[in-house]
């Protein structure tokens, strides 16, 4: 079946790299500079990804193989393959509309990126807080004062919350 | 061929919340971002935000925010939009766009009708 | 919010003619730039990405051109089924948007 294949469309051959060329007898053509083929016997390259502005090379473009783009210092990658560069905010704060603000009180940010997150509320799971918290750091719930005596078990800290959803550009 | 097929058209009063689906079928891949954009009679198009199927991080625009939820269910691979507090503004096409750099694949789109 | 600014809003044109459509970037987007094509009750339609790259399936009689704030688009040569509204969009920085629109109608 593959031979026959091969018979019938000549493309079938041309190797990734490479494009099947209707000017020349469909006979097997290097893609042109800035483009590049990822799979053999396609009829045209695709043009290269241009990392520019905020966007900068992560690695470049080969006659096989787009180039990825990454984001320059200061910013970090959204989206697949990198389509988005969002602005990176310190620890305890948040990317507005107007830029990075501080986190309110009762809420923390431990990345450069996402949005304030509520601390953890101890007393729903029957603890007290053994650590406060600050606008970088959630709580650390401790066990419940009625728990506080000799041999009690150690304390063990909240587990990480995933980033929410809903995060400001 | 990639497709999106989003849910019917909605009619709703002011103040209630809509949820509209895109599936997406076809040549889809395991980490890509679907965009919702909406379009009121006679407007240009606006971009509301995306999700990326892989990892569910999703932004909105700083206009809509607070006011809407964009979901993604790996197992249905469709997208979800859920805008809420609505007003006779928010009347317009919703579309759900794939984007691998460019908004490349297109759902139909779904009328939402805002009215008392 | 970077704000894309299309002339004409709309002009007309008869089959055969070269119409050029122009979008301006109230800031520098490189070469982040699409547009679409989008006809009546449809959803757009991706002609060209990063300003002069054609969408597969689009026909040659289209082209982009441009960088930096000021972007052109080009059909060289009208056809029937070209009378439709033209959009830039940039995606440069999010909210990603969108020109204005220019409506080509059948002169």
């Known amino acids: 079946f593959e031979r026959t294949r091969s018979l019938q469309d000549p493309c079938s051959n041309c190797p990734a790299g490479t494009f099947c060329d209707n000017n020349r007898n469909q006979i097997c053509s290097p893609c042109p500079p800035n483009s590049f083929s990822s799979a053999g016997g396609q009829r045209t390259c695709d043009i290269c990804r241009q990392c520019k502005g905020v966007f900068r090379t992560r690695k470049e473009c080969s006659s096989t193989s787009n180039a990825e783009c990454d984001c320059t210092p200061g910013f970090h990658c959204l989206g697949a393959g990198c389509s988005m560069c969002e602005q990176d905010c310190k620890q305890g704060q948040e990317l507005t509309k107007k830029g990075c603000k501080d986190c309110c009180f009762g809420t923390f940010n431990d990345q450069k990126r996402g949005i304030c997150r509520p601390w953890t509320n101890c007393s729903l799971d029957g603890k007290s807080v053994l650590v406060n918290g600050t606008k970088e750091r959630d709580v650390v719930c401790g066990p419940s004062p009625a728990d506080l005596s000799p041999g009690a078990s150690s304390v063990t800290p909240p587990a990480p919350a995933r980033e929410p959803g809903h995060s400001p550009q | 061929q990639v497709q999106l097929v989003q849910s019917g058209a909605e009619e709703k009063t002011p103040g209630a919340s809509v949820k509209i689906s895109c599936k997406a079928s076809g040549n889809t891949f395991n980490n890509y971002d679907i965009h919702w954009v909406r379009q009121a009679p006679g407007e240009r198009p606006e971009w509301m935000g995306w999700?990326?199927?892989?990892?569910?991080?999703?932004r909105n625009s700083q206009k809509f925010q607070g006011r809407v939820t964009i979901t993604w269910d790996t197992s249905a691979s469709t997208a979800y939009m859920e805008l809420s507090s609505l007003t006779s503004e928010d009347t317009g096409v919703y579309f759900c766009a794939r984007a691998e750099g460019p908004l490349d694949y297109w759902g139909q789109g779904t009328l939402v009708t805002v009215s008392s | 919010d970077i704000v894309m600014t299309q002339t004409p809003s709309s002009l007309s044109a008869s089959v055969g003619d070269r119409v050029t459509i122009t979008c301006r970037a109230s800031q520098g987007i490189y070469n982040y730039l699409a547009w679409y094509q989008q006809k009546l009750g449809k959803a757009p339609n991706l002609l060209i990405y990063a300003t002069s790259n054609l969408q597969s399936g689009v026909p040659s009689r289209f082209s982009g051109s441009g960088s930096g704030t000021d972007f052109t688009l080009t059909i060289s040569s009208l056809q029937p089924e070209d009378f439709a509204t033209y959009y830039c969009?940039?995606?440069?920085?999010?909210?990603?948007?969108f020109g204005q629109g220019t409506k080509v109608e059948i002169k």
């Open positions: 969009q940039q995606s440069y920085s999010t909210p990603w948007t």
């Open positions: 999700i990326n199927s892989g990892n569910g991080d999703t």
